[in-house]
Amino acid sequence: ASHSGMINPSRQWQTLKQNTGVAHFEYQIRVTCDDYYYGFGCNKFCRPRDDFFGHYACDQNGNKTCMEGWMGPECNRAICRQGCSPKHGSCKLPGDCRCQYGWQGLYCD
């Protein structure tokens, strides 16, 4: 027995039925992507990381989900202390607020 057609990657099992006239076949099949690959063509990659290149986990669709305190397309930009002046303060670590020269205070304001 052979099956021809598209089967999209899924965690679900699909039941295929075939009647050849001589015998009746019923079988279950599923196609899964390799580890860290996602999408219909398994052509999206996401592997959690927490280093210079980014700080993220992956959702069930392979989208990057930033760890707490991080943002940006690669989750490599720190979210500064709430209230930190966007003009006079900045941070490289989450919750931080480093002041520009000449500015001070908890929020560099």
Epitope: Y37, R47, F53, G54
Partner: antibody
């Protein structure tokens, strides 16, 4: 469309420094890191380092540590690579490239010739 | 540093041939591997990233496979424009080293 345009060819004497620029356009400059790669005549590709364009933090290959400086000017969306104490072995084409998952975009290359 | 061993260093083949280039890494890099094609006087061109994802616009005769330490680039049926030098590169950790290259020549 995404473009990386590099500065022109340079001829330098041994011991001198060279600064190559890479002007980006067609995307948000601070969203992607810039890498520098070089290729000596008839040789393979050699990764030199990466700069985080948002923070200006850089990481260099051990071989170039102490001799290379990578910087960015976010106001002009330009990355710079400066190599000091040049020697004849530094004669190469220097490329800037963009990316996190491999380099889909490259500059056209800058030939740096070191000769006395 | 992660070492990249690419083989063969050169290869002669004919139009229509199936060609395989391999890249071996000194440690597990999962799927953080990229393949490039470079023609003389030009910047490299991205073919495959994350070991097996074809970049947009790259013909389907190119394919990549492998994970961990062993990777393969396959060209299913060589075309005249495929004669070039091919490089692998890992992008797992710093430094992002390249393989030594494979020069693909016309037989």
């Amino acid at each position: 469309q995404v473009q990386l345009v590099q500065s022109g060819a340079e001829v330098k004497k041994p011991g001198a420094s060279v600064k190559v620029s890479c002007k980006a356009s067609g995307y948000t400059f601070t969203d992607y890191a810039i890498h520098w790669v070089r290729q000596a005549p008839g040789q393979g590709l050699e990764w030199m380092g990466i700069i985080n364009t948002y923070y200006g933090d850089s990481k260099y290959a051990q071989k170039f540590q102490g001799r290379v400086t990578m910087t960015v000017d976010t106001s002009t969306s330009t990355a710079y690579m400066e190599l000091s104490s040049l020697r004849s072995e530094d004669t190469a084409v220097y490329y800037c490239a963009r990316g996190y998952d491999g380099f889909a975009y490259w500059g056209q290359g800058t030939l740096v010739t070191v000769s006395s | 540093d992660i070492q990249m061993t690419q083989s063969p260093s050169s290869l002669s083949a004919s139009v229509g041939d199936r060609v395989t280039i391999t890249c071996r890494t000194s440690e597990n890099i999962y799927s953080y591997l990229t393949w490039y094609q470079q023609k003389p006087g030009k910047a490299p061109k991205l073919l495959i990233y994350h070991a097996k994802i074809l970049d947009s616009g790259v013909p389907s005769r190119f394919s990549g496979s492998g994970s961990g330490t062993d990777f393969t680039l396959t060209i299913s049926s060589l075309q005249p424009e495929d004669f070039a030098t091919y490089y692998c590169q890992h992008h797992y950790d710093i430094p992002w080293t390249f393989g030594g290259g494979t020069k693909l020549e016309i037989k």
